[in-house]
Interface confidence: low
């Protein structure tokens, strides 16, 4: 999994949230929950949860085995939640297992979390 | 240092097939998405689609059905394009690139004349 | 499919100029969008991804914004290097899309 993460760190310059935090005191980025790991069965429903918060709200991406997760129409989606955002998958095949990564951006820091969908 | 390789430019007949290779290095192949770019002649750019090394699944741009194949060498960590009846219209420059297109081969210029 | 459309198609300017380049998605892409140079001859080279992140190793000069439809590159102050062109592509959708690219040249 580490070669997961830093090739998709690659994505996500870290230059720029290396500045004091005495430029913005209020600005935070916390991962609150790490990802799930999913178990399911072929033409079911997946759902994969990135729970973060920051200030100013997050921006939050995904990936998949480092590639970006592209939205397939009704069947592939993410979407903003309250607590971040939720990749569902539909109809699920076996081509979809994978690790699954989200990247998380207030535009000075980043978290990311990731969760293995099998 | 990560690096795409592919081989040389062709030159093919009308009706011919052509195999362009995307030699891998400096990461680990498997786990990266890789994608397939044509660019014709004075033209933009147009995604082809992409094979995914791990488990050799391919995803299509469906304006390249059915002449177009993505295989791989993992043993060699490279990919390959092959076009078979080739038609003038496919005389392009064709790139592999990495998952997160920040890593590009230097392109394969294929003409198909006869 | 998602079309990009960008304007202008071509561009003179000269070294020192703000240049800016639109790239207009016919659907929501969110921020899922990479601005690309080419230079003749060479394969396409990752300025911008995610819209507004500047990717590893290029200059602070080049700059993006925007989300949903609607896209912008900027470049702050036109150097000799910067005379190329510049590509947007969305990957929120299959098949993934180019823009028709923008042509920068000198004045």
């Known amino acids: 999994q580490e070669t997961e993460l830093s090739v998709s760190a690659e994505l996500v310059p870290t230059s720029s949230w290396n500045i004091s935090s005495e430029l913005n005191k209020d600005s935070y980025l916390t991962l609150d929950e790490p990802m799930n790991n999913i178990t399911t069965s072929l033409g079911q429903t997946a759902e994969l949860h990135c729970k973060v918060s920051g200030n100013p709200p997050p921006t939050i991406r995904w990936f998949k085995n480092d590639a970006p997760v592209v939205q397939e129409p009704r069947r592939l989606s993410f979407r903003s939640t309250i607590y971040g955002s939720r990749l569902r998958i539909r109809n699920l095949d076996t081509t979809d297992t994978g690790y699954f990564q989200c990247v998380a951006t207030n535009g000075k820091e980043v978290v990311s979390s990731t969760g293995v969908l099998f | 240092q990560v690096q795409l390789v592919q081989s040389g430019s062709e030159l093919k007949k009308p009706g011919a097939s052509v195999k362009v290779s995307c030699k891998a290095s400096?990461?680990?192949?498997?786990?990266?998405?890789m994608h397939w770019v044509r660019q014709a002649p004075g033209q933009g750019l147009e995604w082809m689609g992409w094979?995914?090394?791990?488990?050799?699944?391919?995803k299509f741009n469906h304006k390249f059905d059915g002449r177009f194949v993505f295989s791989l060498d993992t043993s060699v960590s490279t990919a390959y394009l092959q076009i078979s009846s080739l038609k003038a219209e496919d005389t392009a420059v064709y790139y592999c690139?990495?998952?997160?297109?920040?890593?590009w081969g230097q392109g394969t210029l294929v003409t198909v004349s006869s | 499919d998602i079309q990009m459309t960008q304007s202008p198609s071509s561009l003179s300017a000269s070294v020192g100029d703000r240049v800016t380049i639109t790239c207009q998605a016919s659907q929501d892409i969110g921020n899922n969008l990479i601005w690309f140079q080419q230079k003749p001859g060479k394969a396409p080279k990752s300025l911008i991804y995610?819209?507004?992140s500047l990717a590893n190793g290029v200059p602070s000069r080049f700059s993006g914004s925007g989300s949903g439809t609607d896209f912008t590159l900027t470049i702050s102050s036109l150097q000799p290097e910067d005379f190329a062109t510049y590509y947007c592509?969305?990957?929120?959708?299959?098949?993934?899309?180019f823009g028709p690219g923008t042509k920068v040249d000198i004045k």
């Open positions: 995610f819209a507004t």
């Open positions: 400096g990461y680990t192949l498997t786990t990266n998405y």
């Open positions: 592509l969305q990957y929120r959708e299959y098949p993934l899309t």
């Open positions: 690139a990495r998952s997160d297109f920040d890593y």
């Open positions: 094979i995914y090394p791990g488990n050799g699944n391919t």
